[in-house]
Interface confidence: low
């Protein structure tokens, strides 16, 4: 029966990469059905409840804070909720990560971050965000400054001693504009990452426009240059009729 | 420590209406959601329904719908459950429960003993 | 609704002996995704109020003696009584707490010989 409706969402408030003692806020999606919201944290396939709120759906979306945030309290979270007949519906599942140096100092090394073909591109164009690191890295994730959705993640490719993997950005639309940051994980804890790279901008860059302003601004200087011209020889026609007379 | 002190016993003729009482202490009321279970010779326990000490919302049992009210003041952590058209049917002991995080319940009230009787 | 079905209604037992009551459910308890059976068993000693044993179907309440254990899983379910003792006359009842329309059983009344 849980079929019937469309799955709730919930969300982080603000980036789902959280740096070490953090917080972050969760929102879960009131249901109009539910009389009891609980935010679980899924951990080894079991399910630990996180917190719960008592608000029904006509007040505002449940909300939760988790604070000093660690590894153990990043992962996978759910929101359950408890409604008349049906007695559980579930959320989406937000992953949440932590940032910081890891206790065994694996993840001490940040990864760098470049871009190819050039950080300022036009819209339509193919970017590629190449995230590098000397050091062991199983995964790597790429998160966008302000963004609220999960970071991309891409198992890396061990190239010749260095592990790096390549997001592909293609085509490039105004949205991919922002400053971006990877960031290196291992596969004991996907969910605890390293300290991230150097920010790197990436400019989206409308060069139809700039181009048509730019032609704009050169034939106004042509066309400013032509009066000037047509002037000076005017202004040149009449002093030599005056030195004829 | 948590303690439910429900009103006591009541005595009413058919037809009126009555107002059982359970307050909470010992914890922070508005934390747990506040059951009602009837229980009668005929019936053993009945599920009468539930009430956010939180917001006031409800969730009753259909066969109880209309029969009972379930109400709650924050300000003295107290559930209220009001029982309307008294008949002998509803002669019974009425237990308030409180429900814990894995949906049971932890704690229960002494419960109140209701007789309907002309 | 779900429909809970305790067997047997009452049994009289000397002290010391070992005691086992059934409680079936009309439809499955378990919940897949938290791996819990919602069902709880309660003891209502004459004169008191009901008092939970059990809960998670297994999971035994603090304070409770180790004398009692829930068993069973989806609809089959059952309360064990290791040794039983003169305190434990009462009346067992199980709720399922899997539909928010809980339902409890009829109860199995246990006496003492």
């Known amino acids: 029966q849980e079929g019937d409706f469309p799955m709730p969402f919930i969300s982080a408030k603000s980036s789902p990469v959280i740096p070490l003692d953090g917080s972050v806020k969760i929102q879960c999606q009131a249901i109009r059905e539910a009389y009891l919201t609980q935010l679980m944290i899924i951990k080894n396939s079991t399910y630990r409840e996180i917190g719960r709120r008592l608000k029904f759906w006509n007040e505002t979306d449940p909300e939760f804070v988790i604070d000093h945030m660690d590894a153990n309290k990043a992962g996978r979270y759910q929101c359950q909720y408890r409604i008349g007949h049906y007695r559980f519906r579930y959320s989406d599942t937000l992953e949440l990560v932590v940032t910081g140096e890891e206790p065994a100092g694996r993840l001490r090394d940040r990864p760098s971050l470049s871009v190819r073909p050039s950080p300022s591109v036009a819209p339509g164009e193919n970017v590629t965000l190449l995230c590098q690191s000397g050091n062991r890295t199983d995964t790597f994730l790429l998160s966008k400054e302000g963004a609220a959705h999960r970071p991309l993640r891409l198992r890396s490719q061990d190239q010749d001693g260095w592990y790096q993997a390549e997001f592909s950005l293609s085509p490039v639309t105004s949205a991919h504009g922002g400053t971006y940051r990877c960031y290196r994980s291992l596969s004991t804890n996907p969910y605890l990452l390293s300290q991230p790279s150097e920010p790197l901008a990436l400019l989206v860059a409308d060069y139809t426009m700039q181009n048509l302003i730019r032609m704009g601004l050169a034939a106004s200087v042509l066309l400013l240059l032509g009066i000037l011209l047509c002037q000076a020889r005017h202004d040149h026609g009449g002093a030599r009729e005056a030195a004829r007379s | 420590q948590v303690q439910l002190q429900q009103s006591g016993p009541e005595l009413v003729r058919p037809g009126v209406s009555v107002k059982i009482s359970c307050k909470g202490s010992g914890y922070t009321f508005t934390d747990y959601v506040m059951h009602w279970v009837k229980q009668s010779h005929a019936k053993s326990l009945e599920w009468i329904g539930v009430?956010?000490?939180?917001?006031?919302?409800?969730n009753y049992n259909q066969k109880f719908k209309g029969k009972a009210t379930m109400t709650v003041d924050k300000s003295s952590s107290t559930a209220y459950m009001e029982l309307a058209r008294l008949t002998s049917e509803d002669s019974a002991i009425y237990y308030c429960?409180?429900?814990?995080?894995?949906?049971?319940?932890?704690?229960w009230g002494q419960g109140t003993t209701l007789t309907v009787s002309s | 609704d779900i429909v809970m079905s305790q067997s047997p209604s009452s049994l009289a037992v000397s002290a010391g002996e070992k005691v086992t009551m059934s409680c079936k459910s009309s439809?499955?308890?378990?919940?897949?995704?938290?791996?819990?059976?919602?069902l709880a068993w309660y003891q209502q000693k004459p004169g008191q109020s009901p008092k939970l044993l059990i809960y998670?179907?297994?999971t035994r309440e603090s304070g409770v003696p180790d004398r009692f254990t829930g068993s069973g899983s989806g609809t089959d379910f059952t309360l064990t009584i290791s040794s039983v003792q003169a305190e434990d006359l009462a009346v067992y009842y199980c709720k399922q707490s899997y539909n928010l329309m809980y339902t409890f059983g009829g109860g199995t009344k246990l006496e003492i010989k």
């Open positions: 439809q499955s308890l378990l919940n897949s995704r938290t791996r819990k059976n919602y």
């Open positions: 998670w179907a297994s």
């Open positions: 429960a409180r429900e814990s995080d894995g949906y049971y319940f932890d704690y």
């Open positions: 009430i956010s000490t939180y917001s006031g919302n409800t």
